[in-house]
C-alpha cells in the first residue's frame, strides 16, 4: 500500500466517496474525491513488475497450491484414520492455504488488467483479509506443528484422544484470533480510484493519510506478536529437536527419521526466509516510511515481498510430505497417476509372492496410517 493524496470534495480532509462520480465530461469522469500517487509508485503500478511478474507468480501459486492443498485436506480429513495433533494442524494449514488461493484468479486478473479492480469493494476486502489471514494462520499453525514435532520426540507416547482435542481447541483459537486481528483489513476502505492512471486499486494505495499511523502500528503489532514470537518458538523447537536427534541412538529407522526431520527444518526455514520474514519486515518498513516521510522508497520491494509470501501455499505441501506418511503416499501416487487402492493391491500381491518364494528382492512401502517421521 502506498499513500494516496486525498483531495476530498466533502470538506473533510482525507476521507470521501472514492468510487462515486458526479458526472462525465468527455472521455473522463469527474471524481468526487481524488487520490494522487507519486511518480515512482505510479511507475510501479503501471510497470512490468506488477502487471507481468506478479500475475506469473500468483498463477504458479494457484496452479500448484490449489490441487496440492486440496489433496492434503482430503487426505487429512478422509484418508487418515488417526487424527494426531500434527494431522489436525496440517489440515488447518491446508484449509488456510485453500481459503487464500481460491481468490487468486481475481488477483491475477487485477494485476493483468493494470492493477485495475473491477470486482467491487467487498470482494477486495475479502481478498486482502484472506491474504493476510493466510500468512498469519500459516505462521501460527507452522509454530504449533513445529512445537508438536518436538514434543513427539521428547514424549514419544501413543496417540490419545485428549491430545487431539487440545489440538482442535488450539486450532479453533488460532482461527478466532486471526479473524479478530484481520477485522481492520475488512473495515478499512481498500479500493481507491487513481484519476492519473485511470485505475481503481485494491489495497495498493492507502485511502486515508490518517490511517498511516494506524497501519504502521497495526502491522508492527502483527510482526511482533504473530511473526517474531511464533518464529522464536519455531526456531527453539527445531534447535531442541536437532539436539535430541543428535543424541539419540543410531539405527536405520532413526536415520530415516533424522533425514526427514532435517528436510522439514530446511523447508520451514526456507518458508521463513522467502515468505514470512521479508513480508513482515517490509510491511513495517514501508508503513514507517509513509508515516515519517509521506512516501515509501521500498514500495517495489514491499510489493515483491508480499507476492513471495504467497509461495507458502506451495511450500506447505512439502511440510505435509515430510510429516505425514499418508500424504506422502497419496502425493507419490498422484504424481505417478496411480490410485492408492491399486498400490495396495500390488503390495498385497507382492507380499504373497514373497512368502511363496521365500526369497524375494522386492521391498514395498507400507501404507500404514502412522503420521510421524
Amino acid at each position: 500500500t502506498i499513500q494516496g493524496t486525498n483531495r476530498s470534495s466533502k470538506g473533510r480532509s482525507l476521507i470521501g466517496k472514492v468510487d462515486g462520480t458526479s458526472h462525465v465530461t468527455g472521455k473522463g469522469v469527474t471524481v468526487e474525491t481524488v487520490f494522487s500517487v507519486d511518480e515512482f509508485s505510479a511507475s510501479v503500478l503501471t510497470g512490468k513488475l506488477t502487471t507481468v511478474f506478479l500475475p506469473i507468480v500468483y498463477t504458479i501459486v494457484f496452479v500448484v497450491g490449489l490441487p496440492s492443498n486440496g489433496m492434503a485436506l482430503w487426505v487429512f480429513l478422509f484418508r487418515t484414520k488417526k487424527k494426531h495433533p500434527a494431522v489436525i494442524y496440517m489440515a488447518n494449514l491446508a484449509l488456510a492455504d485453500l481459503l487464500s488461493v481460491i481468490w487468486f484468479p481475481l488477483k491475477i486478473a487485477y494485476h493483468i488488467h493494470g492493477n485495475n479492480w473491477i470486482y467491487g469493494e467487498a470482494l477486495c476486502n475479502v481478498l486482502i483479509g484472506f491474504f493476510y489471514g493466510n500468512m498469519y494462520c500459516s505462521i501460527l499453525f507452522m509454530t504449533c506443528l513445529s512445537v508438536q514435532r518436538y514434543w513427539v520426540i521428547v514424549n514419544p507416547m501413543g496417540h490419545s484422544r485428549k491430545k487431539a482435542n487440545i489440538a482442535i481447541g488450539i486450532s479453533l483459537a488460532i482461527w478466532l484470533l486471526i479473524l479478530l486481528v484481520t477485522i481492520p483489513l475488512y473495515v478499512v476502505k481498500q479500493t481507491i480510484f487513481i484519476p492519473a492512471l485511470n485505475i481503481t486499486t485494491c489495497h495498493d494505495v492507502l485511502p486515508e493519510q490518517l490511517l498511516v499511523g494506524d497501519m504502521f502500528n497495526y502491522f508492527l503489532s502483527l510482526a511482533i506478536g504473530v511473526f517474531l514470537f511464533p518464529a522464536f518458538l519455531t526456531a527453539s523447537a527445531y534447535v531442541l529437536m536437532i539436539r535430541m536427534l543428535r543424541s539419540s541412538a543410531m539405527d536405520e529407522n532413526s536415520e530415516k527419521k533424522r533425514k526427514r526431520a532435517i528436510k522439514l527444518i530446511v523447508t520451514v526455514l526456507a518458508m521463513y526466509l522467502i515468505c514470512f520474514t521479508p513480508s513482515n519486515l517490509l510491511l513495517v518498513v514501508h508503513y514507517f516510511l509513509i508515516k515519517s516521510q509521506g512516501q515509501s522508497h521500498v514500495y517495489a520491494l514491499y510489493i515483491v515481498a508480499l507476492c513471495l509470501s504467497t509461495l507458502n501455499s506451495c511450500i506447505d505441501p512439502f511440510v505435509y510430505y515430510f510429516v505425514s506418511h499418508d500424504f506422502r503416499d497419496h502425493a507419490k501416487n498422484a504424481l505417478l497417476c496411480r490410485s492408492v487402492r491399486t498400490v495396495k493391491q500390488m503390495q498385497v500381491s507382492l507380499t504373497s509372492k514373497k512368502h511363496s518364494r521365500k526369497s524375494s528382492s522386492y521391498s514395498s512401502s507400507s501404507t500404514t496410517v502412522k503420521t510421524s517421521y
Epitope: 493524496t5 482525507l14 465530461t25 468527455g26 469522469v29 471524481v31 494522487s36 500517487v37 511518480e39 509521506g294
Partner: antibody, heavy 119, light 106 residues
Framework: QVQLVQSGAEVKKPGSSVKVSCKAS????????ISWVRQAPGQGLEWMGV???????YYAQKFQGRVTITADESTSTAYMELSSLRSEDTAVYYC?????????????WGQGTLVTVSS | EIVLTQSPATLSLSPGERATLSCRAS??????LDWYQQKPGQAPRLLIY???SLATGIPARFSGSGSGRDFTLTISSLEPEDFAVYYC????????FGGGTKVEIK
C-alpha cells in the same frame, strides 16, 4: 519550449458564463494535467480544478457544479468554463501544467486571463 | 482542508540582505510544499518544489527547508529583481495556497 497561452480578457454580465482557453505547446496534453487557479484583485491564489491527460477531472468543492474543465487533444487546448457568474468571480484566471503525480508542482503557468463580471 | 499561514505578511529589506519567509501548515504535509514568486501583472513562477528542491533556472540564492508543518524559504542575498510576493502551496491533501508574503524594498 513549454508554453501555455491563454485567451484574452473578458467582460461578462452576472449570471452568464465564461469560457477561458489555454493552448499548450512544447508538451503533450495527454501526458500532463492542467490545473486552473484564480486570483481576485489584490488577493491570493485559489485552486479551482484539474483535468488529467486521460480526461478525468476534479473540482474544488467551492466551484463544484459551476465549473467545467475540458480538453481538446487535437488542438492541444484546455478549457475552463465558469457559469452563473457573480461579481466575486472577477479575477485573473491562470492555467498551470502539472505532471499529474503527487511529487510534482505546477511548473509552467499561462499568462493569465482577466475576467471582469459587471452589470 | 489544510490551511497554510505565511509570515510575515510584509518583509521590508534592502538589496543584499538575507530574507527568511515562513509557512506553517495546519497539519502534517511531510515535504509536499512548493514556493512560488509573483511579480505585479505576471503569473506565479515556481521557485522551490517538495520543500527543498530548486526548480529549473532558479538562482542558487533561493533555498527551501523544513518538513511536516513548518517550512522556510530563504533568499541568501536579495537582488533587486527578488522584490515580489511569495506564495507557499501544499499538495499533500488538496491544493491550497498560503496568503502570501510581500518582500518590499526598505
Amino acid at each position: 519550449q513549454v508554453q501555455l497561452v491563454q485567451s484574452g480578457a473578458e467582460v461578462k454580465k452576472p449570471g452568464s458564463s465564461v469560457k477561458v482557453s489555454c493552448k499548450a505547446s512544447g508538451f503533450s496534453l495527454s501526458s500532463y494535467a492542467i490545473s486552473w487557479v484564480r486570483q481576485a484583485p489584490g488577493q491570493g491564489l485559489e485552486w479551482m480544478g484539474v483535468i488529467w491527460g486521460n480526461g478525468n477531472t476534479y473540482y474544488a468543492q467551492k466551484f463544484q457544479g459551476r465549473v467545467t474543465i475540458t480538453a481538446d487533444e487535437s488542438t492541444s487546448t484546455a478549457y475552463m468554463e465558469l457559469s452563473s457568474l457573480r461579481s466575486e468571480d472577477t479575477a485573473v484566471y491562470y492555467c498551470a501544467r502539472w505532471r499529474g503525480y503527487k511529487d510534482y508542482p505546477f511548473d509552467y503557468w499561462g499568462q493569465g486571463t482577466l475576467v471582469t463580471v459587471s452589470s | 482542508e489544510i490551511v497554510l499561514t505565511q509570515s510575515p505578511a510584509t518583509l521590508s529589506l534592502s538589496p543584499g540582505e538575507r530574507a527568511t519567509l515562513s509557512c506553517r501548515a495546519s497539519q502534517n504535509i511531510y515535504k509536499w510544499l512548493d514556493w512560488y514568486q509573483q511579480k505585479p501583472g505576471q503569473a506565479p513562477r515556481l521557485l522551490i518544489y517538495n520543500a527543498y528542491s530548486l526548480a529549473t533556472g532558479i538562482p542558487a540564492r533561493f533555498s527551501g527547508s523544513g518538513s511536516g508543518r513548518d517550512f522556510t524559504l530563504t533568499i541568501s542575498s536579495l537582488e533587486p529583481e527578488d522584490f515580489a510576493v511569495y506564495y507557499c502551496q501544499q499538495h499533500n491533501s488538496g491544493w491550497t495556497f498560503g496568503g502570501g508574503t510581500k518582500v518590499e524594498i526598505k
